[in-house]
Interface confidence: low
């Protein structure tokens, strides 16, 4: 066969669907690889062809679109399963071609099982809610296109294993779940089960997402440098190890890049000749506020090093701060016998 632009296996789009539920999968070519959409391709005389490779096999096979009740079908650029079976797991390829043009991409599809409490190997999307921030909503995700707007589905929401009814601050409102005031206790997995009829059959769509309650922007502050500070002096003798921690608190800020760095005499440590190492550790509070610690270490400090300026800097979307460490050379204790002897006029 003639050459085909092969985009390979698109593992970035690892698609997971639940067993025994409808699934609609769009060909990724039009979403991520080509500059035109399906309608344009179709009107230009291009044909979309689907095939697949079963799990643990190398053989590419055509997809059987003649199964009972049209269990698998194709509609425009969408591959439909009504419903999926466990052995539908495999790598699926969509190929767009005519006599002069060919482009294809493969993607993995995994059909997963869930238990009665909706636990499964499914990777769950995370939805962040601001703590004590007034009414916030989550929406049952990825249900568009499964049924026409004339169909009114029934939606049931669960937190973990429990149906949400008569919860204090969580109220189901159709496709939305409203949190009147989000609290840490609202952290957890939430599942919506959408039930709808189609051609005399009843289908269920199960969607689970993780809710994580995070720090509110109204509580956010610029970075706070806890160390170094004015209350600790790093007093060292030449030859000793100098260790200075820079500990910075960052309020949670959505999509903020938190940065901590040291300067020595105004330069980044990489730009100076002294043998300095920096180790970083990061911890998070329950609301994803972040504490970063960068420990500056000079194994054998010299008297020159003890005269330098060591400044810890921090930056987030809320602002930039800096704090200098108080470093000084330890005055050696008097050598008692010699000085005493000198004091008595000994020579």
């Amino acid at each position: 066969s003639e050459r085909c632009d092969d985009w390979g296996l698109d593992t970035m789009r690892q698609i997971q669907v639940f067993e025994d539920e409808p699934a609609r999968i769009k060909c990724p070519l039009f979403e991520h690889f080509l500059k035109f959409n399906y309608s344009t391709a179709h009107s230009a005389g291009l044909t979309l062809i689907w095939y697949w490779t079963r799990q643990d096999r190398d053989l590419e096979e055509p997809i059987n679109f003649r199964l009972p009740e049209n269990r698998i079908s194709k509609e425009k650029d969408v591959l439909w399963f009504r419903p999926t079976l466990l052995n539908d797991t495999g790598n699926y390829t969509c190929m767009l071609r005519n006599t002069t043009y060919c482009s294809k991409v493969a993607f993995p599809l995994e059909v997963v099982q869930k238990d009665s409490c909706f636990n499964s190997p499914m990777k769950l999307p995370v939805h962040k809610l601001y703590i004590e921030y007034g009414i916030q909503r989550i929406t049952c995700p990825n249900v568009d296109g499964y049924f026409p707007s004339s169909v009114k589905p029934t939606i049931t929401w669960y937190m973990g294993c429990y149906k949400i009814q008569n919860f204090n601050n969580v109220i189901p409102e159709g496709m939305n779940l409203s949190f009147l005031i989000a609290l840490i206790s609202n952290n957890g997995n939430y599942t919506c089960v959408v039930t709808y009829p189609e051609n005399g059959r009843t289908f269920h769509l199960t969607r689970t997402l993780t809710v994580k309650v995070v720090g509110s922007p109204k509580n956010a502050v610029p970075p706070v440098i806890h160390s170094p500070n004015d209350h600790v002096v790093y007093e060292k003798e030449p030859g000793e190890e100098l260790l200075i921690p820079c500990t910075v608190y960052f309020s949670f800020l959505m999509d903020s890049r938190n940065e901590v760095w040291w300067t020595i005499d105004g330069k980044k440590p990489d730009d100076i000749t002294i043998d300095v190492t920096i180790n970083e550790s990061i911890s998070h509070s329950r609301t994803e506020d972040e504490t970063r610690t960068q420990i500056l270490s000079i194994k054998k400090v010299t008297s020159e090093d003890l005269k330098r300026s060591y400044v810890c800097h921090a930056r987030s979307a809320k602002g930039e701060v800096a704090k200098a460490a108080k470093v000084k050379q330890k005055v050696p204790a008097p050598r008692y016998t010699v000085e005493l002897a000198c004091g008595f006029g000994a020579t």
């Epitope: 703590i131 502050v221 440098i225 608190y249 509070s285 329950r286 602002g319």
Partner: antibody, heavy 118, light 111 residues
Framework: SVEESGGRLVTPGGSLTLTCTVS????????MGWFRQAPGKGLEWIGD??????STWYASWVKGRFTISSTSTTVDLKITSPTTEDTATYFC???????????????WGQGTLVTVSS | AQALTQTPSSVSAAVGGTVTINCQSS???????LAWYQQKPGQPPKLLIY???KLASGVPSRFKGSGSGTQFTLTISGVQSDDAATYYC????????????FGEGTEVVVK
Amino acid sequence: SVEESGGRLVTPGGSLTLTCTVSGFSLSIYAMGWFRQAPGKGLEWIGDIYAGSGSTWYASWVKGRFTISSTSTTVDLKITSPTTEDTATYFCAREIDAGYVGYGFNLWGQGTLVTVSS
Amino acid sequence: AQALTQTPSSVSAAVGGTVTINCQSSQSVYSDYLAWYQQKPGQPPKLLIYWASKLASGVPSRFKGSGSGTQFTLTISGVQSDDAATYYCQATYNGRGWYRAFGEGTEVVVK
């Protein structure tokens, strides 16, 4: 220095604003806290304000009944719908260190008495 | 909510003696930001110790703070009659912004 004012006798359900006037330091770099102490009882933290970023924090029991705000030289505490349990001496205090940290409060006012009674 | 339990609630000491006051937190205090205050009747609190063990400016060295995490102690050595007062511990927590909490207080009586 730090000085509270505005304490008085107020009826339940009314509203009252206490003012903390500061001098000798900038509110933009110090955190300020409001506290209260009922007669014969212990100290209770109400909330903090860090004017540098306009951020406020409140004790969990406050539930919107107290609001802290600031100008360049004052920090206000607004009490809405007070009850007899809000009868106390109210103190304003400054954090020991510039920059918002949690060390403690080293500069306190003498307090202002609020009596809630019908 | 965070709870700070101070013990004992009252302690009596002779001049020159030693007093130990404990403060236990129900959860870890952020960066050991625990302060100790002294309060005399009709006066505002006075900061004695901050950051668990640092002596505030002008405070005599007979006051000593120690501890970390959830367990903290204030020790007054060589107690003087002027030390008769109520002592409070105060912790700073970090969760949703910054949160403070006080212990219930310990009354120190000097005989």
